[in-house]
Structure formats: C-alpha cells, structure tokens
Interface confidence: low
Amino acid sequence: AITEAREEAKPYPLFPGPFPGSLQTDHTPLLSLPHASGYQPALMFSPTQPGRPHTGNVAIPQVTSVESKPLPPLAFKHTVGHIILSEHKGVKFNCSISVPNIYQDTTISWWKDGKELLGAHHAITQFYPDDEVTAIIASFSITSVQRSDNGSYICKMKINNEEIVSDPIYIEVQGLPHFTKQPESMNVTRNTAFNLTCQAVGPPEPVNIFWVQNSSRVNEQPEKSPSVLTVPGLTEMAVFSCEAHNDKGLTVSKGVQINIKAIPSPPTEVSIRNSTAHSILISWVPGFDGYSPFRNCSIQVKEADPLSNGSVMIFNTSALPHLYQIKQLQALANYSIGVSCMNEIGWSAVSPWILASTTEGAPSVAPLNVTVFLNESSDNVDIRWMKPPTKQQDGELVGYRISHVWQSAGISKELLEEVGQNGSRARISVQVHNATCTVRIAAVTRGGVGPFSDPVKIFIPAHGWVDYAPSSTPAPGNADPVLII
C-alpha cells in the first residue's frame, strides 16, 4: 500500500489527524492541503500565522512581459507537512511549482535533512506545459520505509541564480521499539550488587521497559526508557533480558548470562618441553578460569628422591604464556612438578603431578689432592688424585682429562690424556728433560668436562740426577709449588 500526498483543491479539514498538516497513514490515506488554508505545514507540526502566503524561499523574476508587467513570485505550492506511517509500508509525496515558460532547463532536486539525495531512482519529475506556464510536479516514493528514512524532505529549484525551496515534508516512520542499548553479559562476584542497562526508542514514544530474570518479570510496573536495573547480588548464574513496549507492540532484548566468579579449575596436561642439567622447561593447559581472568601461576617442585627432605620449591610466574623454565635445579635429579593458577577469587587446586628429570651436567668441582711425582727409574711421571664429591659431579663420572704442559728453555708443549672413571692415578711418559711439567686434572661426565684442578708443577731434571720427592696441589693462598729434584 502506497501512501500518497498530493496537491488538490479540496478544503483543508480541521485537524484531520493528530496535528494540523499531518498525515496519519494508518487512518487517512489521502490528504490535500489547499493554498488558501490558514494553516501552513511546518516541521514539528507547528502551524504558522494565518494569512501568510508561504514559508519557503520565493524568487521574484526580473524579466517583464510585453505589457511590462512583472511576473508573479515563484514558489512551491503547499503540500502535506507530516506523514506518519508504519515500517515497511510504502509512501509517495510530491512538491509542485508553476514556472513561466520563459525559463528553460529548470530542474528540481530533493534534499533530506540538509543533504542532497543523489541517484534519483526514487524521484520522478513530470512537466505539464500550458500557454504561459509549465506545471512541474516532482514525486518522491519509497516502497518500503525503514527507520533510516525518518527525516525532513524538501525540494529545491534554481532560477536566475536564485534558489527556491519548498516547505519541509516530515516523514515519521513508526514501528516496534528499537534497542539502542541492551544489557550485556557480566561476570560478577557472589552476593555483590551490579547494574544492567536497557534503552529503546520509537517512534512512537514513549517506550516502557520491563525486566525479566530467568523468564520471570522483575518489575511489576514498567519504567520509562532508559532503565537501569540494580541487582543486589546473586548466588548463582542467572539470565536477564528486557522487554520494550510502545503503541506498536513489544520487542525483547537478547538474553544475557550473568556468571558468578569462582576459583579456577586446576591446569591440565602439564608436560616437559626441554630438560637440561639445571633447568626444566614445562608447559601446561590452563583449566577453566572461573569467569575471572588468570592473574598468575605457581609451579611447585619437589625432589622425587625418597631420601630428600620433602621441601617444596615454589616458582611464581605470569599466567601467560603457559610456559615456564624452572631453574636452579640439581643435575641428574628427579623432580615432581605441579602447577596451580589463580584469579581474583583464589588459587586453583594443583594439577596432576608429573615426574621430570634433569640431565647430566659437567662436574662443578675439580678432582682433589692432586699429587705428582717423578718415577726416574721408568722415566715416568706418576699422578694421583681423589675424585670430586659425588654430589658435585653433576652426573655419572666417565673419566678424567689430564693436561700436562712441558716447559723448558724456549719450548712449551701441552698434551691431553683421557683416563677411565675407575682410576685415581695415571702415569705419563717424560716428554722433555731439564724442564718443568705442569699438571691439571678435570673430571668428565657425559654432560661435559668440569673445571681443571689448580696446576701442580714438578721439575724434571736431566738424566742421572738424584732422588725425587712428590709435588701436590697447593694449599689455598699459596703460590704454585715448583719442586726441583
């Protein structure tokens, strides 16, 4: 159904609709407004003073006829001022003007709310020429109105660099309430008050709001939009929505879930990403966050060795990126690892514990009590030592590395020997006589070579010298001993 407003010569009925100059399409499909009417159509439905000929712009032509009489002022004829219709209905309205034939190329443009409507597929302009004037009727039609079509429409025509503007035609599209603000899902602390907001608009106004909690109305009396619902507190999850009512009917907002914050679920799938002698890289999958963002996580580490004192090391880290490198661990040790995470409510339970092991590292100390002496009869240097403490080996001992440096006038020569793990002595051949031999020993595990012992020096005399005595690791603070035999 198309609602049409056009010019006719009928008298204007007194208050045919809600306001003078208005068109209520649901009741009065056709309305005309005579030129002589005492009421002028105006935006916002307010009538002008009786007797005023026109509210739009008027152009006074400067051209005169043969009799030298001036032409009458040009103005758009009056038309309907206010059209009210329901959403999705069709509407057609027009503006008309009579233009003397001396003017050529007159065009009419349509404007809405101060902006020109381009792409005139809605607009049709018809010309009705006569002897002296041409009647021009510009029609504008909308087949299915929407709320966005609400507004003030005018026609404009340019003549002699003058702009002629019609009175506005106000289109009011009425429909069910339209939400401009709906309640939003929230995560709230148990028994703590919170607010929900709902706002809807017409036309038609007013719009009244009812609140609904878990399918039951909260307020018996409606509140004018906008409405704020204060909920004093919840002990369990609830769903809220709001109903917006106006004369056209009812619109229901989306239902929003209000969740109660709780402690998180424990992390799952704790796994070992990488393991070194002194560190273990772990990752985990966070549990459910209890409707509150994770703040941080705690990694709990305890020695799995039954003889350990059972103390727990606690490492705190940020909740992201679900990855943590546990450091300061002993080499070749077994650990139980659990992860717990917290949100603003509290800590989760600990994840299932997993077992992890560090790898071997290089020994952290050198062999002890290194002693070196010359076995002149066999032309060998005998070396003895004590193995480092087991705890500081950082792995299973696989042997020792012996460095012996021979220095005499102008010669310096370093040699390396490997010795099996069971030995605590070694014998090396004399390389140079009349020289100093400097010996250092390091323990070796699969994790690498440990630090070398402090150097022990012994002088190897020329052949045929007298007795010899051992040389050993110096006491702390002493200079390197050089034993000359």
Epitope: F315, K327, L329
Partner: antibody
Framework: EVQLVESGGGLVQPGGSLRLSCAAS????????MNWVRQAPGKGLEWVSY????????FYADSVKGRFTISRDNAKNSLYLQMNSLRDEDTAVYYC????????????????WGQGTLVTVSS | AIQLTQSPSSLSASVGDRVTITCRSS??????LAWYQQKPGKAPKLLIY???SLESGVPSRFSGSGSGTDFTLTISSLQPEDFATYYC????????FGQGTRLEIK
Amino acid sequence: EVQLVESGGGLVQPGGSLRLSCAASGFTFSSYSMNWVRQAPGKGLEWVSYIISGSDTIFYADSVKGRFTISRDNAKNSLYLQMNSLRDEDTAVYYCARDETVVRGVINYFDYWGQGTLVTVSS
Amino acid sequence: AIQLTQSPSSLSASVGDRVTITCRSSQGISSALAWYQQKPGKAPKLLIYDASSLESGVPSRFSGSGSGTDFTLTISSLQPEDFATYYCQQFISYPTFGQGTRLEIK
C-alpha cells in the same frame, strides 16, 4: 627512587657471629625477591643467598650453607643476613641486591644494589 | 656450578675506542646472562640483561650479544666515565659471576 642501605658490618673473630641488615625504600619491597652478594677485597663478585618475596623459597651458596641465614620483614621493608661460624674467607663487602623480577621464585639478575657493608673476619 | 670465564682480564683503551669483552660459559645457558659495571668503592650497576636487553637509563653505546656459551659486551665509543671493571653473571642456575675485566685508560 629505589634505595638499599646495608648496615651491621664490622670486625669479628673467626667463629664469631654478625647480623647484617638492609633497609629498602622507593619500591614495593614485599613484591620483590632479594639477594646478598659479596666481594672479597680485590676480588670478584660472589652470590651468597636469595629469598623470595613471601620468604617461602630460600637458596644459599654452598660456601655459606649451614652457617648463614637469610630472612626478611616485609612490614619493616628490611632484609637480614645472620652470619654464624664466620671464617677468614668470609671477609668481604656484603651487598644487598634486588632481584629484577616481581614474585618469581627464581634468581635472576640484580637491578638495584646497596652501597655495601664491610665484614672483616680476623683474629 | 657453572663457570664463567671473561677475557681479557684487563684491557687498555682510549676515549672513542670500540671495546669488546667476552664471557664464556662452561655449559649452555641460553640467554640467561647479565653484564654489570663496577667502579672502585662503588656497587655494581646493571647494564645488560637477557644477554642483549639494555637496562633502562643505560647509554645506547653499550650492547650485548650471544647465546648458549659465548657472549659479548661491546662499548661502541668509549667515554671517560666507562673506565671501570665489568662482570658477566649467569642466572640459569645458582648465580655465578665471571672474574671481571678491568678497563683502563691507555
């Protein structure tokens, strides 16, 4: 401005005891792990001990284990090092140092240091 | 314990020189390494952490690089205030420091 001020150093005989204090200001002391680091005269730096913000994780260097005790009082913004059975080799300037990371039970690097207090162990 | 070896032990240079100090670890430590500057009678000052990150307030002429076992501290253009002793420190295990590198005016 972050400030760490050590006190309590002095001359003590071998086998004796001493208690060092470190007064912290200019930051939220209770959020940070703290350390003691020492430096023997003319020598390099040696880490001594670590305590996490909540005092539930503590580490010691092997050289002081069983003889030194680290503690803290978050209400007083203070860090302590109780040193017993002191030896000649404990002679050093002792620095209180803040661990760079908030609430992580791992020793990292040290972003703020005090000016140090000298401990001399000698008969 | 993880051992850190700095080289050289001492170094003479002039204002405007580019200086490089190296630190070698006895085992892989990823990028868990820091560099400090210490002047006589003063506490150490943090320069670089995580091997290459510049501490806030430290001049950009200081830079760090390396990963695993070999690390470098570079001063791109020496200034008079840079003459000091420099230490590296690992923090993947219980902290240990290098023996120090003394940077002197030539």
